[in-house]
Amino acid sequence: MNGRVDYLVTEEEINLTRGPSGLGFNIVGGTDQQYVSNDSGIYVSRIKENGAAALDGRLQEGDKILSVNGQDLKNLLHQDAVDLFRNAGYAVSLRVQHRLQVQNGPIGHRGEGDPSG
């Protein structure tokens, strides 16, 4: 019997200061570039080593970015989302959704990764 995969979803406000080489990450997604099935949201696909996001440490690959400086990223074309980040100024506030995978064992059994054993 296989374990069930669940996800723990949390939201966080991350304030980044643009560094000498920018914010230091890549994105995928948009209404014209659906990276996740049935979801046109914007996702972090890469965090650049020693970039502003990496040095801050909170933004992770796979995070969904919900808004930039209070502006919702829903229903945006991919390039429009890119441009929004590029024009976001020196201090950039990101509302992000982290999705942590949680592996559960079969019912009645403790999962391998369960720390309470």
């Epitope: 080489s21 920018g22 972090v44 890119v82 980040f85």
Partner: nanobody
């Protein structure tokens, strides 16, 4: 992990043409930013051209002579090189990164790319 395989290099006379190909593994190829770099003996690796979701970018030295294009159905990016010059002689490398950088004008930086091919030699005499 993304694997890149280049082909199409060779020797050509000045003024001639070559077309390089780079085929990538991965099911989300259309989201990759793809680029070509080159390295001549004793020189730094140099940006040639890149293509992202939003368009193509070129080094000044190749603008008007080289054209980068992609076929997402074939997971392949091409570099059409026309009016070749002896100074174009180098090993040409294909590079890839998933997604688009949110930082302006970073497309020509080798540090922006996570995956690299083995390279293909181009010699112009």
């Amino acid at each position: 992990h993304v694997q890149l395989v280049e082909s199409g290099g060779g020797s050509v006379q000045a003024g001639g043409s070559l077309r390089l190909s780079c085929t990538a593994s991965g099911r989300t190829f259309s989201t990759y930013t793809m680029a070509w770099f080159r390295q001549a003996p004793g020189k730094e690796r140099e940006f040639v051209a890149a293509i992202s979701w939003s368009g193509a970018y070129y080094a000044d030295s190749v603008t008007g002579r080289f054209t980068i294009s992609r076929d997402n159905a074939k997971n392949t990016v091409y570099l059409q090189m026309n009016s070749l010059k002896p100074e174009d002689t180098a090993v040409y490398y294909c590079a890839a990164v998933i997604g688009s950088t949110v930082d302006s004008y970073r497309t020509g930086d080798p540090l922006e790319y996570d995956y690299w091919g083995q390279g293909t030699q181009v010699t112009v005499s």
